[in-house]
Amino acid sequence: ITCPPPMSVEHADIWVKSYSLYSRERYICNSGFKRKAGTSSLTECVLNKATNVAHWTTPSLKCIRDPALVHQRPAPPSTVTTAGVTPQPESLSPSGKEPAASSPSSNNTAATTAAIVPGSQLMPSKSPSTGTTEISSHESSHGTPSQTTAKNWELTASASHQPPGVYPQGHSDTT
């Protein structure tokens, strides 16, 4: 049993090392954003025992604009592209450690994860408070406005290709 690509988080990317059950992965915030104190970048692949379907727990991560950083706009393709940031203290919870990801729950359903349709892109996640789709103006790998810039990187033992069609890539780009 494996998980589909994890849901998108606004202003964050994710590189999935393993889609296996109980794998734990971390999102990272885009340049110019920082993790809001008290939120967690962790997500875990868990099993919904009621449906016997694996899914990722919903991360509490919020990537917020960091006023201490000079946020550069996406640069046009060029010979050399550099996006640097200025020093700033890390955003940590009062305990000084990042809170753990929300506990796996057997009653979590696909409604809290990305809906995957074979041969399609990763569907946008919904805002818990409004039910509306969160939109980010960040540039995607394809140079088009995207839902977020979250992408999944699958860790493989070597550079050999995985069997085709095992997992959707999980781009959160919407066109």
């Epitope: 340049s31 592209t81 140079g143 995985q162």
Partner: nanobody, 121 residues
């Protein structure tokens, strides 16, 4: 098939700087998303920074924000990781990674062989 070769690792004192380079071959470099990962002894391989194929979006893990900068030179088929204000906890093997962006299917991550970075106190 994508081949990646890292360089620039070494021993440096805390507070110092290093610049890692990763040369890619085997595919059009400008079509690749690139990233740097690191793995400390006994720990998992973690994402450090990433840059998309156009160079328009970069991301950093919390602990390196403001200290590390990822960049790419498409003319030289090379991605860089400028590491400033290094700390002992940055000690790890650093891996270059590449991926062909795909919206519909899984694509493998291509890995370099890694380069050791050791920060002494």
């Amino acid at each position: 098939e994508v081949q990646l070769v890292e360089s620039g690792g070494g021993l440096v004192q805390a507070g110092g700087s290093l610049r890692l380079s990763c040369a890619a071959s085997g595919r059009t470099f400008s079509s690749l998303d690139m990233a740097w990962f690191r793995q400390a002894p006994g720990k998992e391989r973690d994402t450090v920074a990433s840059i998309n194929s156009s160079g328009g979006t970069t991301s950093y893990t919390d602990s390196v924000q403001g200290r590390f900068t990822i960049s790419r030179d498409n003319a030289k088929n090379t991605v860089y990781l400028q590491m400033n204000s290094l700390k002992p906890e940055d000690t790890a093997v650093y891996y270059c990674a590449a991926r062909v962006p795909s919206a519909v299917s899984a694509t493998p991550i291509y890995w370099g062989q890694g380069t050791q970075v050791t920060v002494s106190s």
